[in-house]
């Protein structure tokens, strides 16, 4: 069955909800990225007016494996220390909470999941100008909210209204089970400068205890660009290939599931010296996209031009250089071989896939290389005629959310 | 002071839709989140379900199916809708504001509903 | 979804006595979102205790909350006639406990 939905009548307050979205210069399209290829024939078309994104996002837990493809290390190597389980070992799979997208309001389907996005929320962007719907959906068993580091104009979906009480949406929790409907609208202040990349690299997380929902895994992309950047799927125009790499130190020791990991994966729980030094370095997790020691194996295209959104984002302080063994790529329109992140930020760049192979991507920092901070590129020919062109994906909104008098009742 | 006062008819039959409206005074429907709770007969509270005019909403899975919510906040009052009754649906049926859903700070004091045929 | 289970199902005390209640979640539920409520034969339910330990407004400071994670506790240190009714812990502003009856023994 249907999630119920919240009828209205006569409310004095959807007036810049109603008038945003029945503009006639607004297209509105639900984004479903099941379908995309990999790679594009044909460069994509640029869409003319703002529009509406709408995405059902959910808060979900489970347990993550951060080394699906590594087999038990030796017990002597380094990589033991973080994925082996033992009496003072969590090893390699926490319980954690993910941001999953659905396909309606039911929260019955999933999208479908890429493994190298890894533990990512779904990747959602808008250009300036346009909005997104984020139905969000709670089925966590703790308070969280989801809410986008580089948006300015939040708010609730049908009014700008909030609970008494409440002084900014950013630290309002959505409880286990509740659906909170936010309207994100992308903003001239919010784009990209014309010194700035077509597409900012932002993101999204929980914002209730940020530093305790991201260590438990709310993390999420969220590209910003300028007009006519992307299609009408939200591919970024002059690009086969969109990447998101998340460099993300997860310190497990913060994780609001600690406890129930350590009674769930340790043999003898009350065993455990929380505060032994060693165990909780065993805990904090050097990871891309959400995973350790090279199981993040991404491939691309021989001769695509790939866009890579590149995140640093959790437990690290200091600043990163990343790199791609093999590759240069273009970085505010210069060539380099390294790009700096600073914590809780995020850089666009873009490169050509010219050298055939299997390539590290990892950081300089050979303290995280050692902790699992690397992971593997490989390039190689893709028989160009398997894939088909983007096509215009439309969808008109579903009339419960856009209907003029705001009626909301069930399909 | 806030009052809040439900009203609707006392039998409803099996099958049919049970309606009703609780009316709030003293209070803008838009400030708070507000709830629906229910009392079977000798038995304990049963939550129904809970919403925010501006776009929160959470519902007891095992009614959600039948469940509708509505709010008028030209006339400051908020209903609920509970679809193919039975006689398990008896009960006194409560409308109450959430103080950001830490607690039903006020209730209404309570309508019954019985279905029968 | 969180189960939350009350005991005694039934108390049985004298006046003057001191009255401990207990709720029991499945789950950890974030205290801020646990509440007690005291509900008298043909009234509507009102709540005594809020976010696990604070008093609601004109609540005599008789009562007490305590608790956190899965397990919480509501305590009447001296009983007094006018206490005695069914008592309900609801988290997240949504399920309710099955109830404790406190009577008069």
């Known amino acids: 069955p249907e999630e119920p939905q919240l009828r209205m009548k006569n409310n004095e307050e959807a007036e810049d909800y109603d008038d945003d979205l029945t503009d006639s210069e607004m297209d509105v399209v639900r984004f479903d990225d099941d379908n995309s290829p990999s790679f594009i024939q044909i460069r994509s078309v640029a869409k003319k007016h703002p529009k509406t994104w709408v995405h059902y996002i959910a808060a979900e837990e489970e347990d993550w494996d951060y080394a699906p493809l590594v087999l038990a290390p030796d017990d002597r190597s380094y990589k033991s220390q973080y994925l082996n389980n033992g009496p003072q070992r969590i090893g390699r799979k926490y319980k954690k909470v993910r941001f999953m997208a659905y396909t309606d309001e039911t929260f019955k389907t999933r999208e479908a999941i890429q493994h190298e996005s890894g533990i990512l929320g779904p990747l959602l962007y808008g250009e300036v100008g346009d909005t997104l719907l984020i139905i969000f959906k709670n089925q966590a068993s703790r308070p969280y909210n989801i809410y986008p580091h580089g948006i300015t104009d939040v708010r609730p979906l049908y009014s700008r209204r909030l609970p008494k009480g409440v002084k900014h949406l950013k630290d309002f929790p959505i409880l286990p089970g509740e659906i909170f409907k936010y309207k994100w609208t992308v903003t001239v202040e919010d784009g990209p400068t014309k010194s700035d990349p077509r597409c900012l690299t932002r993101y999204y997380s929980s914002f209730v205890n940020m530093e305790r929902d991201l260590a438990s895994g709310l993390i999420g992309p969220l590209l910003i660009c300028y007009k006519e950047s992307v299609d009408q799927r939200g591919n970024q125009i002059m690009s086969d290939k969109r990447n998101v790499i998340l460099f993300s130190v997860f310190d497990e020791n913060r994780s609001w599931y600690l406890t129930e990991n350590i009674q769930r994966f340790l043999p003898n729980p009350a065993g455990v010296q929380l505060e032994d030094p060693e165990f909780q370095a065993s805990n904090i997790m050097h990871s891309i996209n959400g995973y350790v020691f090279d199981s993040l194996q991404l491939s691309v295209c021989l001769h695509e031009v790939a866009y890579w959104y590149i995140l640093s984002i959790g437990a690290q302080t200091d600043f990163l250089s990343v790199f791609f063994s093999g590759y240069t790529f273009k970085h505010k329109m210069v060539y380099e071989d390294t790009l700096t992140l600073f914590p809780f930020s995020g850089e666009t760049v873009f490169m050509s896939m010219e050298n055939p192979g299997l390539w590290i991507l990892g950081c300089h920092n050979s303290d995280f290389r050692n902790r699992g901070m690397t992971a593997l590129l490989k390039v190689s020919s893709c028989d160009k005629n398997t894939g088909d062109y983007y096509e215009d994906s439309y969808e008109d909104i579903s009339a419960y959310l856009l209907s003029k008098n705001n009626a909301i009742e069930p399909r | 002071q806030v009052q809040l006062q439900e009203s609707g008819p006392g039998l409803v039959k099996p099958s049919e839709t049970l309606s009703l409206t609780c009316t709030v005074s003293?209070?803008?429907?838009?400030?708070?989140?507000w709830s629906w709770i229910r009392q079977p007969p000798g038995k304990g509270l049963e939550w129904i379900g809970y919403?925010?005019?501006?776009?929160?909403?959470n519902y007891n899975p095992s009614l959600k199916s039948r469940v509708t919510m509505s709010v008028d906040t030209s006339k400051n009052q908020f209903s609920l809708k509970l679809g193919s009754v039975t006689a398990a649906d008896t009960a006194v049926y409560y409308c109450?504001?959430?103080?950001?859903?830490?607690?039903?700070?006020?209730w209404g004091q309570g309508t019954t509903v019985t279905v029968s045929s | 979804e969180i189960v939350l289970t009350q005991s005694p199902g039934t108390l049985s005390l004298s006046p003057g006595e001191r009255a401990t209640l207990s709720c029991r979640a499945s789950?950890?539920?974030?205290?801020?979102?646990l509440a007690w409520y005291q509900q008298k034969p043909g009234q509507a339910p009102r709540v005594v205790i809020y976010?696990?330990?604070n008093r609601a407004t004109g609540i005599p400071d008789r009562f007490s909350g305590s608790g956190s994670g899965t397990e919480f506790t509501l305590t009447i240190s001296r009983l007094d006639p006018e206490d005695f009714a069914v008592y309900y812990c609801?988290?997240?502003?949504?399920?309710f406990g099955q109830g404790t009856r406190l009577e008069i023994k």
């Open positions: 109450a504001r959430s103080q950001l859903r830490y607690y039903l700070d006020v």
């Open positions: 003293g209070d803008s429907i838009s400030d708070y989140y």
């Open positions: 919403f925010f005019y501006s776009g929160g909403s």
């Open positions: 789950q950890s539920v974030d205290s801020n979102y």
């Open positions: 976010g696990a330990s």
């Open positions: 609801q988290q997240y502003g949504s399920f």
